[in-house]
């Protein structure tokens, strides 16, 4: 990756990520420096026939740092504070090559739920107010509602009217996604409206 266009890399909170380094084949490499937000992370003197010299210079991330055979950076047990700008500088006998990365740490989506507030009108039309949510949602989570493969809404909330006399059985699916995971949850309009109908008739009696 050239320094002008950083490679966007997504990592999952608590898991591992690799920032891939294109090691110059056949060249004499003096050293590789890895930087995080312009602070030195590691200084590596690579070797072909013996073990490389690896000097980890950032104690905070040190224990979670590792390097592949081609000196790509591996970071394990990812934390939110690992988010930021990473750079690798490869110094060879002929030039200095720079690779840039932007690491974004995202949570694996968990516990998708749909809450509903439904109303039954006197004409027997059922109005569904559906709200989709996931645990620890942040700005990186997107929601959409689908029915029969069509997107009805690109928000967590969906309001639909369902008339059992003219509508066939209908499922509404909420899809929650971020760059590293997606979850879905489907609800049946008929089932939800039947539940409302039972409540309605119970209160009438």
């Amino acid at each position: 990756q050239s320094s002008l266009t950083p490679l966007m890399v997504n990592g999952i909170l608590g898991e591992s990520v690799t920032l891939p380094l294109e090691f110059p084949a056949g060249e004499k490499v003096n050293f590789i420096t890895w930087l995080f937000n312009e602070t030195s992370l590691a200084f590596i003197v690579p070797h072909e026939t013996k073990s490389p010299e690896i000097h980890v210079t950032n104690p905070k991330q040190g224990k979670r740092l590792n390097f592949t055979q081609s000196y790509s950076l591996q970071l394990s047990n990812l934390k939110m504070e690992d988010t930021g700008s990473y750079r690798a500088q490869i110094s060879t006998k002929t030039s200095a090559k720079l690779s840039s990365y932007t690491l974004r740490i995202l949570r694996q989506l968990r516990n998708i739920q749909v809450t509903n507030h439904s109303q039954l009108f006197q004409n027997m039309t059922c109005e569904l107010h559906l709200t989709c949510s996931v645990e620890d949602a942040d700005d990186n989570v997107s929601f959409r509602w689908e029915a029969l493969g069509n997107t009805l809404s690109s928000q967590p909330n969906l309001t639909v009217s369902w008339d059992p006399r003219i509508s066939s059985e209908q499922d509404y699916t909420c899809i929650a996604e971020n760059a590293v995971s997606n979850l879905s949850f489907s609800v049946s309009a008929q089932k939800l409206c039947e539940d409302v109908k039972i409540q309605y008739t119970d209160t009438k009696m």
Epitope: G26, K28, N30, F31, V45, H47, E48, T49, K50, S91, K93, T94
Partner: antibody
Amino acid sequence: QVQLLQPGAEVVKPGTSVKLSCKASGYNFTIYWINWVKLRPGQGLEWIGDIHPGRGNTNLNEKFKTKATLTVDTSSSTAYMQLNSLAFEDSALYYCAREDEDWYFDVWGAGTTVTVSS
Amino acid sequence: DIQMNQSPSSLSASLGDTITITCRASQGISIWFNWYQQKSGNIPKLLIYKTSNLHTGVPPRFSGSGSGTDFTLTISSLQPEDIATYYCLQSQSYPYTFGGGTKLEIK
């Protein structure tokens, strides 16, 4: 033990070419770079270039780009440097040297004295 | 190209003396800096590699130091066998360049 064997001397005519050899023994020839260095009396050492025997890739000092050609024969563990269009100023002692991965010359050949004489 | 300015070009010292030879690079070098000793009629012999590391078998009276553009070879307690020409070499970038050499003589 690790050795680089070079012939002692070559006497050549101006305008001709000469191919100097450097035979390695005692180590895996294909994994260490071989460098060539020129020594002229009263002029000090001058780096000519290097070659990786396993990969065949070379790097030449710009000054020697049209003068020197580096090759290897892995079957005989020998590195070669051909010097062409020889002139009197090419008269010198030419060393081959093995380069360690920490980028220093740890083993040297005894050198070949090239004399350009009409 | 990185130019290596080595000084002095010649040096006369007494046995037991401590002497220093300096190489100044035309641009910064990280650690790829070496020192060689060449005795008359012999091949160059590595003394110091990567600025300050003593090569196997080299007496500890030889030491190397420096960073950036200025590098030094120090020989303490000068011995008769130290009579030679000393060269610095930068192997940081192509083309590799040697210093002009320092001819050491005993008074």
